[in-house]
């Protein structure tokens, strides 16, 4: 039950996280005009990864896409790449994790296969979250650098007669959405990896001890009162429901006590 809950919660948290990463990537407010300590302007400038916008006091908003690819800063291209990689990995991870969910039965899929898929999706979510966090952090660092550069020469003019105000940009809402979303995806991935450990097949410490009687072979299972005769019957991989005893090679979900499927 705990494994199912952990896996399910990990999936939901990752799903929210990836939705957030997609939202952040599409948002226009990655950087917004800094209004503090600036002349009061009748326009509000903000920029995203794909276009820049200007909201006028009149109520009009005009957005223009970055139609050039080569003319864009390398850092912006890197941020775009990181966010896209994050989305792609996250989307694949979601697809894999759907089939890995313990509560969903697909044919006769082994628990070991589900465990592997859970681990795979978990790793994908972790990498996806890290990509998003890295992308947002790179952009934030770029903003901080530009902010202080523009503060240093905020007013530039000719002989002090004519002044030009440089627009300073600060953190936009998309950065915070990206950081939170990346964090959620990361947490979801960790939860999936933890769930994987519970799903994974494990070697039991309960070893079957055989006592050879003179007449016929009887295998006594510790902790249980049932036995199986050894005449031609294959005891290997046969489940014996004996209140906790297991055969040597048995694949069992952990913890079995709490799995009411």
């Amino acid at each position: 039950m705990a494994v199912t809950a952990c896996q399910g919660l990990g999936f939901v948290v990752s799903l929210i996280g990836i939705a957030g990463i997609i939202a952040a990537t599409c948002m226009d407010q990655w950087s917004t005009q800094d209004l503090y300590n600036n002349p009061v302007t009748a326009v509000f400038n903000y920029q995203g990864l794909w276009r820049s916008c200007v909201r006028e006091s009149s109520g009009f908003t005009e957005c223009r896409g970055y139609f050039t690819l080569l003319g864009l800063p390398a850092m912006l291209q890197a941020v775009r790449a990181l966010m896209i990689v994050g989305i792609v990995l996250g989307a694949i991870g979601l697809l894999v994790s759907i089939f890995a969910l313990k509560c969903i039965r697909i044919g006769s899929m082994e628990d070991s296969a589900k465990a592997n898929m859970t681990l795979t999706s978990g790793i994908m979510f972790i990498v996806s979250g890290l990509c998003a966090i890295a992308g947002v952090s790179v952009f934030a660092n770029m903003l901080v650098t530009n902010f202080w550069m523009s503060t240093a020469n905020m007013y530039t003019g000719m002989g002090g007669m004519v002044q030009t105000v440089q627009t300073r940009y600060t953190f936009g809402a998309a950065l915070f959405v990206g950081w939170v979303a990346g964090g959620l995806t990361l947490i979801g991935g960790v939860m999936m990896c933890i769930a994987c450990r519970g799903l994974a097949p494990e070697e039991t410490n309960y070893k079957a001890v055989s006592y050879h009687a003179s007449g016929h072979s009887v295998a006594y299972k510790p902790g249980g009162f049932k036995a199986s005769t050894g005449f031609g019957s294959n005891t290997k991989n046969k489940k014996i429901y004996d209140g906790g005893a297991r055969t040597e090679d048995e694949v069992q979900s952990y913890p079995s006590k709490h799995d009411y499927v």
């Epitope: 302007t41 009748a42 200007v54 006028e56 006091s57 009149s58 105000v165």
Partner: antibody
Framework: EVQLLESGGGLVQPGGSLRLSCAAS????????MAWVRQAPGKGLEWVSF????????YYADTVTGRFTISRDNSKNTLYLQMNSLRAEDTAVYYC???????????WGQGTLVTVSS | DIVMTQSPLSLPVTLGQPASISCKSS????????????LTWYQQRPGQSPRLLIY???TRESGVPDRFSGSGSGTDFTLKISRVEAEDVGVYYC?????????FGQGTKLEIK
């Protein structure tokens, strides 16, 4: 057709109050920023105040700050200018204007005359 | 506050001749976000309300005759009338639309010689 009709002007004593109204029609009033502009007799244009479409942003000229209050009622398609502590230098024709592209004053009313005199 | 300086303050022109009005701002009106100049030109005919001619420094408002054109960038702007007609008589104002307060120029009175 966009129409802006100012009203409420008149003769008032110094220190007195007046409330100007601007009835708008022919456009989505709640979609646009609005402004008041005045023109003293024989003088140039002077911007007085601005209010955004949702009344979130409000700005005033230094000469009227603390005395004038701009407001709007989007349900009534009406813009207001409450003028208190009026002075002789506030005597002017007051125009109501709707903002357009580039924050320009795209449409103007016919104006209402406010005379501050004892 | 942004200071808008217009010149000349009075402009006598012969009908059919071109006219040019200059407007200088104390600060650049070029917005880096969209590379547009937030300067507007208005015409006020005698006894009438002002009328929008040009916005964004050079974009003509719909319905405005094409003999009116705006140019310039940053701090220096010009309004040109290619061939002055009798109906063009009035006062022309430039206005800063980027910074509050939204200051106007003193106005240029265009009259027929």
């Amino acid at each position: 057709e966009v129409q802006l009709l100012e009203s409420g002007g008149g003769l008032v004593q110094p220190g007195g109050s007046l409330r100007l109204s601007c009835a708008a029609s022919g456009f989505g009033f709640s979609d646009y920023g609005m402004a008041w502009v005045r023109q003293a007799p024989g003088k140039g244009l002077e911007w007085v105040s601005f209010i955004s479409n949702s009344a979130y942003s409000i700005y005033y000229a230094d000469t009227v700050t603390g005395r004038f209050t701009i407001s709007r009622d989007n349900s009534k398609n009406t813009l207001y200018l409450q003028m208190n502590s009026l002075r002789a230098e506030d005597t002017a024709v007051y125009y109501c204007a709707r903002l357009g592209r580039g924050n320009s004053f795209a449409y103007w009313g016919q104006g209402t005359l406010v005379t501050v005199s004892s | 506050d942004i200071v808008m300086t217009q010149s000349p303050l009075s402009l006598p022109v012969t009908l059919g001749q071109p006219a040019s009005i200059s407007c200088k701002s104390s600060q650049s009106l070029l917005n880096s976000g969209n590379q547009k100049n937030y300067l507007t030109w208005y015409q006020q005919r005698p006894g009438q309300s002002p009328r929008l001619l040009i916005y964004w420094g050079s974009t003509r408002e719909s319905g405005v005759p094409d003999r009116f054109s705006g140019s310039g960038s940053g701090t220096d702007f010009t309004l040109k009338i290619s061939r002055v007609e009798a109906e063009d008589v009035g006062v022309y104002y430039c206005q800063n639309e980027l910074f509050y307060p939204l200051t106007f120029g003193q106005g240029t009175k265009l009259e027929i010689k």
